[in-house]
């Protein structure tokens, strides 16, 4: 199972639920569904309040039980380390895969943290991060922002991923904007 890590804004916008949490306990495999279940302790929720309704405390995250079908394997054994988890809700349960955005909170830049907590949501409705995988590539719409990080280096390590968000400049037009300048 291979997938290109998304721009964090894309991960935020395409996810039903975005939380900060610690992985605690030993993973378990459900012997009916064959899904692996990680116990988590949620510390913050950034997206999903409406989707969750009253069940605002997520205690488990679910993933396929095998790597080849995109199961997520949590490698850290540090139970006090916080992770940003962006996943999908299925039957009220948080699901993630290898392709989901799961990253140690401490590994995120200050700009990315600002994005997840406040800014990415502003670009979700109107703007699209458009991956540029090979040259030449051109904008297909004024609401697209060309994401070129993959051309230069690992997509999640690039400047646009770590410091920029695709946000509305005016109706029908989105541009890359610095998250740094927005950090209070």
């Amino acid at each position: 199972c291979t997938c290109v890590p998304p721009h964090p804004q894309t991960a935020f916008c395409n996810s039903d639920l975005v939380i900060r949490a610690k992985f605690v306990g030993t993973p378990e495999v459900n012997q009916t569904t064959l899904y692996q279940r990680y116990e988590i302790k949620m510390t913050k929720m950034y997206k999903g309040f409406q989707a969750l309704g009253d069940a605002a405390d997520i205690r488990f995250v679910y993933t396929p039980a095998m790597e080849s079908v995109c199961g997520y394997f949590h490698r850290s054994h540090n139970r006090s380390e916080e992770f940003l988890i962006a996943g999908k809700l299925q039957d009220g349960l948080l699901h993630i895969t290898t392709c989901s955005f799961v990253a140690p909170w401490n590994s995120l830049s200050l700009a990315q943290r600002r994005g997840f907590t406040k800014t990415y949501t502003v670009g979700c409705e109107e703007c699209t991060v458009f991956p540029c995988l090979s040259i030449p590539c051109k904008l297909q719409s004024g609401t697209h922002c060309l994401w070129t990080d993959q051309l230069l280096q690992g997509s999640e390590k690039g400047f646009q991923s770590r410091h920029l968000a695709c946000l509305p400049r005016e109706p029908g037009l989105c541009t890359w904007q610095s998250l740094r300048s927005q950090i209070a």
Partner: antibody, heavy 113, light 111 residues
């Protein structure tokens, strides 16, 4: 009591196909993931494939991926293994297992020309 | 392609205790509490003796016990009896290969 009975084994030529069945009784079939495990003559056990209770998730060993297909019919309490492009190294006793607690007695598949 | 390492053979006299080891990695034995042990007599299907590292199914003698330390699981049989002579296989959940087995250990009861 829990019972698993395999059938469908036999002699088949290399490149041929075979479909194994496993009739289950004595438990709520749809509540359990099921697996196929095989054992070549004089050798150890090798996991082949698994399927979730609903049939929505299927997993395969690398050695059979793309050639074997696991499926189930919960209305008939039956598990299946469709085996295509069979090779000599697929020769084994094939066991059906209720996610590794109860096992059937096995059915022998021989791939030979 | 044996994933878990077991001794090829062990032996003991009636009444003695023996232990069979099963060594894996942190992605199988060490990472999960899903280790099972099976007993297989010649020409028979495997029979579950221990599941989830140390649990015994009903009907299995309490002479059989399981444990785990790090990446190694162990099956101990106390008060060895003639009918214990069989092949024993360990099995673990593994994230990459889903289910993996040991190569099997032939237990011989002497005398």
């Amino acid at each position: 009591q829990v019972q698993l009975v395999e059938s469908g084994g036999g002699l088949v030529q290399p490149g041929g196909s075979l479909r194994l069945s496993c009739a289950a009784s004595g438990f709520t079939f749809s509540s359990y993931a099921m697996s196929w495990v095989r054992q070549a003559p004089g050798k150890g056990l090798e996991w082949v494939s698994a399927i979730s209770g609903s049939g929505g998730s299927t997993y395969y060993a690398d050695s059979v991926k793309g050639r074997f297909t696991i499926s189930r019919d919960n209305s008939k309490n039956t598990l299946y293994l469709q085996m295509n492009s069979l090779r000599a190294e697929d020769t084994a006793v094939y066991y059906c297992a209720r996610f590794f607690d109860y096992w059937g007695q096995g059915t022998l598949v021989t791939v030979s020309s | 392609d044996i994933a878990l390492t077991q001794p090829a053979s062990v032996s003991g006299s009636p009444g003695q205790s023996i232990t069979i080891s099963c060594t894996g990695t942190s992605s199988d034995v060490g990472g999960y509490n899903y280790v099972s042990w099976y007993q297989q007599h010649p020409g028979k299907a495997p029979k579950l003796m221990i599941y989830d590292v140390s649990n015994r199914p009903s009907g299995v003698s309490n002479r059989f016990s399981g444990s785990k330390s790090g990446n190694t699981a162990s099956l101990t049989i106390s008060g060895l009896q003639a009918e214990d002579e069989a092949d024993y296989y360990c099995q673990s959940y593994d994230f990459v290969r889903f289910m993996v087995f040991g190569g099997g250990t032939k237990l011989t009861v002497l005398g």
